[in-house]
């Protein structure tokens, strides 16, 4: 089939002990080889501190994951979720002030 | 090949301000940060501040902020650094360098001398 | 803003010897965020390790980093003439990004 490119997700979690968890979440892509990774001042974090999810079928013929990291509030302006797919790319920030999610699809 | 290829030598006079290019080749534009950083005549190196090219956000060190600005033209990959109110402890080389996959500065470019004097 | 010590500032060796470079930091850093370059008179500074203890891409087996917390090391196990430069530790941990103030390697 032909490309069809990530709609890209942020969202951060209740903040606990100074920390918040951001996670970055792709969705409705296609093929399902995707680099999907959390980088401060862009550089990407090493693996350690990441999570990431399978790469699954989201039941329309196209593919979903995530990665998660957490951070020190405050901080938040410092990290970008990078995403790689099918020659196409793009950094997504954490969302700032009030707003809990920022989403854009690729094109 | 990646390089990062600056614009030549200024001479400005106290007050005045200028701007240094930086033009990157031989990786996708957008895909790194373009970090900035002087060095002062036989001093150390100092790290001005950086911008995301594919978002346009911009970190600056508090110290430059007042007279610092990052700029970049994506329709000519090509990054920007204007330092205004110009005095004579500005005299450096003025270089950029690209974020790396697994350190903040991993390649540079060749450095561009503005000197300050009246 | 993290300090970063480094010492000594001139150390006077020759070829072939062992050169051992310290980088104090004045506040914790992870060991990912500690980074080594390498400036040679006239040209700019080039990545030599990265997250303490990586060689950078091209860079000779002979260099080596090592340390974590607020001490960090790096050393050249026999000194090549064209390892005759200066040598900044830089911490991405915290901002502002800061380097060192430089050690000197030069020829005894």
């Known amino acids: 089939g032909s490309t069809v490119p990530p709609m890209v997700n942020v969202t951060c979690s209740e903040v606990s002990e100074g920390n918040i968890t951001v996670t970055c979440r792709a969705s409705s892509f296609y093929p399902r080889n995707i680099t999907l990774t959390w980088r401060q001042d862009g550089v990407s974090l090493s693996h350690n501190t990441q999570q990431w999810g399978d790469v699954l079928p989201d039941g329309n013929g196209t593919y979903q994951t995530w990665v998660a990291t957490r951070i020190r509030q405050g901080e938040e302006q410092r990290f970008t979720c990078y995403m790689e797919h099918s020659g196409n790319h793009g950094t997504h920030p954490v969302p700032s002030g009030n707003s809990h999610h920022h989403h854009h699809h690729h094109h | 090949e990646i390089q990062l290829v600056q614009s030549g030598a200024e001479v400005k006079k106290p007050g005045a301000s200028v701007k240094v290019s930086c033009k990157p080749s031989g990786y996708a534009f957008t895909s790194n940060n373009i970090y900035w950083v002087r060095q002062a005549p036989g001093q150390g190196l100092e790290w001005i501040g950086y911008i995301d090219p594919y978002i346009g956000r911009i970190i600056y060190n508090q110290q430059f902020k007042d007279r610092a600005t990052l700029t970049v033209d994506k329709s000519t990959s090509t990054a920007y650094l204007e330092l205004s109110s110009l005095r004579s402890e500005d005299t450096a080389v003025y270089y950029c360098?690209?974020?790396?996959?697994?350190?903040?500065?991993?390649?540079w470019g060749q450095g561009t001398l503005v000197t300050v004097s009246s | 803003e993290i300090v970063l010590t480094q010492s000594p500032a001139t150390l006077s060796l020759s070829p072939g010897e062992r050169a051992t470079l310290s980088c104090s930091a004045s506040?914790?850093?992870?060991?990912?965020?500690l980074h080594w370059y390498q400036q040679k008179p006239g040209q700019a500074p080039r990545l030599l390790i990265y997250?303490?203890?990586n060689l950078a891409s091209g860079i000779p087996a002979r260099f080596s980093g090592s340390g974590s917390g607020t001490d960090f090391t790096l050393t050249i196990s026999s000194l090549e003439p064209e390892d005759f430069a200066v040598y900044y530790c830089?911490?991405?941990?915290?901002?502002?990004?800061?380097f060192g103030q430089g050690t000197k390697v030069e020829i005894k």
């Open positions: 830089q911490q991405g941990g915290s901002l502002p990004l800061t």
């Open positions: 360098s690209r974020s790396g996959e697994r350190s903040n500065f991993d390649y």
């Open positions: 506040s914790s850093i992870s060991s990912n965020y």
């Open positions: 997250r303490t203890s």
